[in-house]
């Protein structure tokens, strides 16, 4: 089953994807792909690296970490409700049937509406306007715009991000990793 | 020490081909990628792709995709580009560099460079 | 392929100035830009590779900073030695690209 991972629309998501390769240099070629893993390589490739570098990629896709050490996460620029699906990162190990094979389900959500100002309350202390939605490598931060008048459901809202990012770190080393060698 | 020396100067005729060498010493010529890169008077650098010793693997620019080939002799540590269908566009600076994992693949050792002109 | 976009083209300086010069990407590159310099009738020598790495024997003068599109090269304290072009290049994908160069002039 798939690992599921969130965005919101207009938003940077993040896709983790990791295998350790068996000597420094020795890297595999990995592809990524709209759609869950099929028998031999990607459907519909949105992004393909070889032994060296990145040699095919669409736009808005790109690998925002250490792809030569093994990270191979994928980074998907202002996304739409289009870009909801299953994505494959593939790590193509050579020999017959080697490949590792990972489908991760990304959701992407309605941008939040911003609520028209009213009475401001100073919550900036207990909810900042930027929240890192991942600690690994650079942080992709989501704007959640001025707080002026927060409720309990909206407090409920906030800490279920937060515990979706929480997740989505946790996974890092469990999900989408391989050591290969 | 590292180095790498570049076969001499070529003058060639438009729609004729050139082979420039680059012989290898100083380090194992089959764990580092050898690059060729090229420059125009006055110009920037353009990279012409890589070839691999090790497995003879290479990666080619798609713009010189079909007029170039990049070929390696192990035994003498040599590395060699051959472009053809030459246009006088063609005529630059060509410098071999080797490239490795340690620096991500950035070319850290520069060949001499080898003057091609082109010209009828 | 990805566009190197690097300014200026031309920078005049006198020696101790401190100089920098940016490289911009057409698109996300990550950390993966290397900086090189090219003295006339020369090769080009690696200065800085993965963003801000500097290479093997470089003076600790010449720094480099940014990632995803925006790369910066800086230069502390100009050297007379250091009078030459330089350029940027994305080492993430293939083809491997150059900026156009950037030019220490003599003010």
């Known amino acids: 089953s798939e690992v599921e991972y969130r965005a919101e629309v207009g938003q940077n998501a993040y896709l983790p994807c990791f295998y350790t390769p068996a000597a420094p240099g020795n890297l595999v070629p990995v592809c990524w792909g709209k759609g869950a893993c099929p028998v031999f390589e990607c459907g519909n490739v949105v992004l393909r690296t070889d032994e060296r570098d990145v040699n095919y990629w669409t736009s808005r896709y790109w690998l925002n970490g250490d792809f030569r050490k093994g990270d191979v996460s994928l980074t998907i620029e202002n996304v739409t409700l289009a870009d909801s699906g299953i994505y494959c990162c593939r790590i193509q190990i050579p020999g017959i049937m080697n490949d590792e094979k990972f489908n991760l389900k990304l959701v992407i959500k309605p941008a939040k509406v911003t609520p028209a100002p009213t009475r401001q309350r100073d919550f900036t202390a207990a909810f900042p306007r930027m929240l890192t939605t991942r600690g690994h490598g650079p942080a992709e931060t989501q704007t959640l715009g001025s707080l002026p008048d927060i409720n309990l459901t909206q407090i409920s809202t906030l800490a279920n991000e937060l515990r979706d990012s929480r997740l989505a770190n946790d996974l890092r080393d469990s999900g989408a990793t391989i050591r290969i060698g | 020490q590292v180095q790498l020396v570049q076969s001499g100067a070529e003058v060639k005729k438009p729609g004729a081909s050139v082979k420039v060498s680059c012989k290898a010493s100083g380090y194992t010529f089959t764990d580092y990628y050898m690059d060729w890169v090229r420059q125009a008077p006055g110009q920037g650098l353009e990279w012409l792709g890589y070839i691999y010793p090790n497995n003879a693997g290479t990666s080619y620019n798609q713009k010189f995709k079909g007029r170039v080939t990049m070929t390696t002799d192990k035994s003498t540590s040599t590395a060699y580009m051959e472009l053809r269908s030459l246009r006088s566009d063609d005529t630059a600076v060509y410098y071999c560099?080797?490239?490795?994992?340690?620096?991500?693949?950035?070319?850290?050792?520069w060949g001499q460079g080898t003057t091609v002109t082109v010209s009828s | 392929s990805i566009v190197m976009t690097q300014t200026p083209k031309f920078m005049p300086v006198s020696a101790g100035d401190r100089v920098t010069m940016t490289c911009k990407a057409s698109q996300s590159v990550g950390n993966n830009v290397a900086w090189y310099q090219q003295k006339p009738g020369q090769s080009p020598k690696l200065l800085i590779y993965y963003a801000s790495n500097r290479y093997t024997g470089v003076p600790d003068r010449f720094t480099g900073s940014g990632s995803g599109t925006d790369f910066t090269f800086t230069i502390s304290s100009v050297q007379v030695e250091d009078l030459a072009v330089y350029f940027c290049?994305?080492?993430?994908?293939?083809?491997?690209?150059f900026g156009t160069g950037t030019k220490l002039e003599i003010k």
């Open positions: 290049q994305q080492h993430y994908s293939s083809p491997s690209t």
């Open positions: 560099a080797r490239s490795g994992y340690g620096n991500y693949y950035t070319m850290d050792y």
